[in-house]
């Protein structure tokens, strides 16, 4: 496939309260179950409808979970990670990495490799500049009428 797929990588702290149906999401990954090549991290594979995570709205399928209640999820067996979530208590703090796909060239898919991202300002600055130019041109056009 031609073109390069880049990602905007942002991190967020998400505090969930375990609801009547639990935290309400599934995970994949771990040292014994790599979801992304060369990455044994823990990823969200499914969010349960009307569960705590879905109602909160911030956690997304494909997000990488970096820590649970301050405990790092690096180099964990899959089941050890599962147990960590299950025993995390009523109030659960998640450090999460979101990856927003930024398309360069032909349309691709959300890849399972290359976790590299680009800084948010590299996208926002040109967008802001274009918006300002468009607004200026529009005002000039209206003045000429």
């Amino acid at each position: 496939m031609n073109g390069r797929v880049d990602y905007l990588v942002t991190e967020e702290e998400i505090n969930l309260t375990r609801g009547p149906s639990g935290l309400g999401f599934n995970i994949v990954g771990g040292t014994d179950q790599q979801y992304v090549s060369n990455d044994s991290g823990i990823y969200v594979s499914r969010i349960k409808e009307n569960g705590a995570a879905a109602l909160d709205g911030r956690l997304q399928e494909g997000d990488k979970i970096l820590s649970v209640n301050g405990q790092d999820l690096k180099n964990l067996l899959h089941q050890d990670a599962v147990d960590l979530f299950r025993n995390a208590g009523y109030a659960v703090s998640l450090r999460v990495q979101h990856r927003l796909q930024v398309q360069n060239g032909p349309i691709g898919h959300r890849g399972e490799g290359d976790p590299s991202g680009i800084p948010i300002f590299m996208v926002l600055v040109p967008v802001f500049a274009l918006t300002m130019v468009a607004a200026w041109a529009f005002m000039r056009y209206r003045q000429q009428l």
Epitope: R18, P20, S21, G22, L23, G24, F25, N26, I27, V28, D32, Q33, Y35, V44, S45, R46, K48, E49, N50, H78, Q79, V82, F85, R86
Partner: nanobody
């Protein structure tokens, strides 16, 4: 997509045994949590048992603990439910189910909303 086909149901006398099988096609069951549910006429679909992707962790409904055993063979892409000491109240249509990943909650919380892929069911009747 994952396609699931159950087999092994039938008519059995109280106290007897049955072994249900669920064969998956379309995708390997690695990374999938597998479960069994059952539905009696006019009632909701209830959780019976589930097994983690590796087979290392299992969970059961209180009503079947000590009588039913769930297992899996990832090489054969198949999940099993061994049912012993069957009771008339075990009569139902039994469904196999699959979902990607591992739920971050214990199976006490489990409902049909936790699973995405379903078989067509196999009837179990205990007389």
């Amino acid at each position: 997509q994952v396609q699931l086909v159950e087999s092994g149901g039938g008519l059995v006398q109280a106290g007897g045994s049955l072994r249900l099988s669920c064969a998956a096609s379309g995708r390997t069951l690695m990374r999938y949590t597998m479960g069994w549910f059952r539905q009696a006429p006019g009632l909701e679909r209830d959780f019976v048992a589930e097994i983690s992707w590796s087979g290392g962790n299992t969970g059961y409904a209180d009503s079947v603990k000590g009588r039913f055993t769930i297992s899996r063979d990832n090489a054969k892409n198949t999940v099993y439910l061994q049912m012993n000491s069957l009771k008339p109240q075990d009569t139902a249509v039994y469904y196999c189910a699959a979902v990607i990943g591992s739920p971050t909650d214990y199976s006490d919380y489990r409902s049909s909303l936790d699973y995405d892929y379903w078989g067509q069911g196999t009837q179990v009747t205990v007389s």
